[in-house]
């Protein structure tokens, strides 16, 4: 007899989720020598333990602590890149600028990037049919709590000058409700972080405005300054050329107009 299953508003767990997480873990530990000591089966067990058999609207950061402990990693000072609503460009950047890191360049972020998962209360099954939607169902769902947990940790461990890439095409360039605005900003440690430098990415040649003067950026500056962290802002008028110059920094055209 088919068992009744809670119907959520969001899409279900990504197909082959356990295999994907395990395979990503193995690949990551092979490529990153400093993480070779990590036992991927233990990582999967800890990941699974955070949400399996638990009501998917009642997940806590505590549930993910065993996983966070196993995935402990440090980023060198001045090498943390945060982002908000502009993931693709941030990742293209760190793929070229290999000594800078987004959360998704770290083990735990890499494991979960673009995946969805949830379980069911009192069963060992993974729900491939539907998972809670943050808006329509609940915010304390397995995916949202995971990203809140690892984002908090990522921000807490950052040091030196931290960079953040922001999408200048959005109506709210800095959004207090984004993961960056609600979690990361508030967990940068003033005793370790000297400055936050925002890179506001322009959407196209049509926009000649100084988006660093945008009211939401001024709001970000205010929040950061109140936390005794210095704030700087740069317009990236030409993201296409920005990436090109990361690849070829010696070209004379990359040194001009700064």
């Amino acid at each position: 007899v088919p068992r009744w299953r809670q119907q959520w508003s969001g899409s279900g767990t990504t197909s082959r989720f356990p295999e994907t997480v395990l395979a990503r873990c193995v690949k990551y530990t092979e490529v990153h020598p400093e993480m070779r000591h990590v036992d991927c089966q233990s990582v999967w067990d800890a990941f699974k333990g955070a949400f399996i058999s638990k009501y998917p609207c009642n997940i806590t950061e505590e549930d993910y602590q065993p996983l966070v402990k196993l995935g402990t990693q440090t980023v060198p000072c001045n090498k943390t890149l945060l982002w908000s609503r502009i993931k693709d460009l941030a990742h293209q950047f760190t793929q070229v600028q290999r000594d800078m890191f987004t959360l998704e360049d770290m083990l735990l972020g890499y494991l979960a990037d673009d995946l969805t998962w949830c379980g069911e209360f009192n069963t060992f099954e993974i729900n491939y049919q539907s998972c809670p939607d943050w808006r329509k169902d609940c915010s304390n769902n397995p995916v949202s709590v995971f990203w809140k947990t690892v984002s908090r940790r990522f921000a807490e461990t950052a040091c030196g000058v931290v960079h953040v890439m922001l999408n200048g095409s959005r109506s709210k360039i800095f959004d207090k409700n984004s993961t960056f605005g609600s979690v990361e900003v508030h967990n940068l440690q003033p005793e370790k972080v000297q400055a936050l430098e925002a890179w506001v990415i322009h959407g196209g040649r049509e926009d000649s405005r100084d988006l660093c003067q945008d009211p939401t950026i001024k709001e970000l500056e205010s929040i950061i300054s109140k936390r005794n962290i210095r704030f700087f802002c740069k317009n990236i008028y030409r993201p296409d050329k920005f990436l090109q110059c990361v690849k070829n920094p010696e070209d004379s055209s990359c040194l001009s107009g700064i």
């Epitope: 196209g204 040649r205 049509e206 000649s208 405005r209 100084d210 740069k234 317009n235 990236i236 008028y237 030409r238 296409d240 050329k241 920005f242 090109q244 110059c245 070829n248 070209d251 004379s252 055209s253 990359c254 001009s256 107009g257 700064i258």
Partner: antibody, heavy 123, light 107 residues
Framework: EVQLLESGGGLVQPGGSLRLSCAAS????????MSWVRQAPGKGLEWVST????????YYADSVKGRFTISRDNSKNTLYLQMNSLRAEDTAVYYC????????????????WGQGTLVTVSS | EIVMTQSPATLSVSPGERATLSCRAS??????LAWYQQKPGQAPRLLIY???TRATGIPARFSGSGSGTEFTLTISSLQSEDFAVYYC?????????FGQGTKVEIK
């Protein structure tokens, strides 16, 4: 030394077509947006079209939209302007010009210009 | 589109004197304005960008000022090689537009 050399101008009948070329040297062509600017005899300057670094975006003056096509071949360091359905009012010297294409500050002006090629549309 | 209006159309100045050229935009262009010099039979040459920044190799006697809608190009002491036509251009909004030019001639 930055050099821009236009070619392809000449006499063409109304309704005809012409393809202008601009050979660039002395700089990394693929790192710059490029434009065409024209000047009718005895008149002022008029911006015609701009193409971004990799040709991903193109912009046109309303007076040429739908008739002219700007393109580039970064492997040949060459900018092109395909002109169709030419009219008498398109008669002008056509200049190829480079935009500084800064990352951290806005640009949209022209720091280097070619010597121009004359296009005459007449029957 | 933004209309750029230059004045005067012609300016008669003696060598060694100061020349002041004006450019007005029909709406604000912030500081996104350039000035060019063009001599007969030659391509234009960039003088000023960002309303006030001199381009590479441009003598200090050329200076630009203004922001928003009102801009000025000043040539502090005219040399013989400065007699030419001067154009302003806005690059704040598409389409980019030029003024009609000011001819600086020998008095």
């Amino acid at each position: 030394e930055v050099q821009l050399l236009e070619s392809g101008g000449g006499l063409v009948q109304p309704g005809g077509s012409l393809r202008l070329s601009c050979a660039a040297s002395g700089f990394t062509f693929s790192f710059y947006d490029m434009s065409w600017v024209r000047q009718a005899p005895g008149k002022g300057l008029e911006w015609v079209s701009t193409i971004t670094l990799h040709g991903g975006d193109t912009y046109y003056a309303d007076s040429v939209k739908g008739r002219f096509t700007i393109s580039r071949d970064n492997s040949k360091n060459t900018l092109y302007l395909q002109m169709n359905s030419l009219r008498a009012e398109d008669t002008a010297v056509y200049y190829c010009a480079r935009d500084p294409s800064y990352i951290y500050s806005t640009s949209g002006y022209f720091d280097y210009w070619g010597q121009g090629t004359l296009v005459t549309v007449s029957s | 589109e933004i209309v750029m209006t230059q004045s005067p159309a012609t300016l008669s100045v003696s060598p060694g004197e100061r020349a002041t050229l004006s450019c007005r935009a029909s709406q604000s262009v912030s500081s996104n304005l350039a000035w060019y010099q063009q001599k007969p039979g030659q391509a234009p040459r960039l003088l000023i960008y960002g309303a006030s920044t001199r381009a590479t190799g441009i003598p200090a006697r050329f200076s630009g000022s203004g922001s928003g809608t009102e801009f000025t190009l000043t040539i502090s002491s005219l040399q013989s090689e400065d007699f030419a036509v001067y154009y302003c251009q806005q690059y704040n909004n598409w389409p980019w537009t030029f003024g009609q030019g000011t001819k600086v001639e020998i008095k």
